[in-house]
């Protein structure tokens, strides 16, 4: 089982949308795949895929999950808030027929405030 996650870095404006993609591949077929998205180590959602469908479409605050055969799991955050900033990791495990698990690399999401004044203040707070 292989999991590839992207992008490595994502910078978006508050109120817009962010799309994180996880590509899950296995040489043989699987009957049930457990997937998980975490943010800063905390679980956002942990649905499974079987018969081509996700058991859950919601993933964390303002998060929508979708599965596109053959291998793409997409987490869409819309609208993005400042609280969405963080490190996201996608994990997958084949539960049937045989247990095998893998996880992607981190996607770092940075959310810029919609208000340019807030942005200036933030920069001023962290010089260098």
């Amino acid at each position: 089982l292989s999991v590839q996650q992207g992008p490595n870095l994502l910078q978006v404006r508050q109120g817009s949308q962010a799309t994180l993609v996880c590509q899950v591949d296995q040489a043989t077929a699987w009957e049930r795949l457990r997937v998980k998205w975490t943010k800063d180590g905390a679980i956002l959602c942990q649905p499974y895929i079987t018969n081509g469908s996700l058991s859950l479409g919601v993933c964390g605050p303002q998060g929508r999950l979708s599965w596109q055969a053959p291998s793409h799991l997409t987490l869409q955050l819309d609208p993005v808030s400042l609280n969405h900033s963080g490190a996201y990791v996608c994990w997958a495990a084949v539960e049937i027929p045989e247990l095998e698990e893998a996880e992607g690399n981190i996607t770092r999401l940075f959310v810029d405030p919609d208000d340019p004044t807030q942005n200036r203040n933030r920069i001023a707070s962290f010089p260098g």
Epitope: T28, N51, G52, E100
Partner: antibody
Framework: QIQLKESGPTLVKPTQTLTLTCTVS??????????WNWIRQPPGKKLEWMAL???????SYNPSLKSRLTITKDTSKNQVVLTMTNMDPVDTATYYC????????????WGQGTLVTVSS | DIVMTQTPLSLPVTPGEPASISCRSS????????????LNWYLQKPGQSPKLLIY???TRLSGVPDRFSGSGSGTDFTLKISRVEAEDVGDYFC?????????FGDGTRLEIK
């Protein structure tokens, strides 16, 4: 360019143990998402998948041969090793190693094969 | 185990004529999760290792002549050669990777008349 090369004895006696080595060049067997396989073909017959070892070290065997097989890898030498116990004349075959990726599932690269004859 | 049944076992063809090989599996090789058929076709030329021609039942490997085509889904698959050339002689094998043990068909020997 990835290359696989099988090596081992060309002749073994019945009841003996066969040890075959697959040396991989141009690619590291520690690369994630790859399976390293052994496949054999008796003269004039069909191909038979024998065993695989995954990047993680997980192994899988053909149930018809499982009790006689052990597949391992030596990452320091970039080699995959297959041992087969209690050899019999019906095990006379050309033995191939081949790779397979999670992204695909086909045998992409094959060695040239090594013919092993089992005879007293 | 999934049994792969190939027909015919022998296929004499005149150069320039079409050829067709059938492969049947004892259970479906289609996954509703990935929307893929886990079926590959190989050609083994005399004295050589097998080489991949078609994967996922119908996708031709880059560099394989377009006279080769694969079709089918579920349990019934076909490899077609639109116009056979002398260099196409050899043994053709289908192979499933739906599950382990990975299994091959008995092979079809294509020869030139």
């Amino acid at each position: 360019q990835i290359q696989l090369k099988e090596s081992g004895p060309t002749l073994v006696k019945p009841t003996q143990t066969l040890t075959l080595t697959c040396t991989v060049s141009g690619f590291s067997i520690t690369t994630g998402g790859y399976y390293w396989n052994w496949i054999r073909q008796p003269p004039g017959k069909k191909l038979e998948w024998m065993a695989l070892i995954y990047t993680s070290g997980r192994t899988s065997y053909n149930p018809s041969l499982k009790s006689r097989l052990t597949i391992t890898k030596d990452t320091s030498k970039n080699q995959v090793v297959l041992t087969m116990t209690n050899m019999d004349p019906v095990d006379t075959a050309t033995y191939y190693c081949a790779d397979m990726a999670d992204k695909g599932g086909w045998f992409a690269y094959w060695g040239q094969g090594t013919l092993v004859t089992v005879s007293s | 185990d999934i049994v792969m049944t190939q027909t015919p076992l022998s296929l004499p063809v005149t150069p320039g004529e079409p050829a067709s090989i059938s492969c049947r599996s004892s259970q479906s090789l289609f996954s509703s999760n990935t929307k893929r058929n886990y079926l590959n076709w190989y050609l083994q030329k005399p004295g050589q290792s097998p080489k991949l021609l078609i994967y996922h039942a119908s996708t031709r490997l880059s560099g394989v002549p377009d006279r080769f085509s694969g079709s089918g889904s579920g349990t019934d698959f076909t490899l077609k050669i639109s116009r056979v050339e002398a260099e196409d002689v050899g043994d053709y094998f289908c192979q499933q990777h739906y599950e382990t043990p990975l299994t091959f068909g008995d092979g079809t020997r294509l020869e030139i008349k």
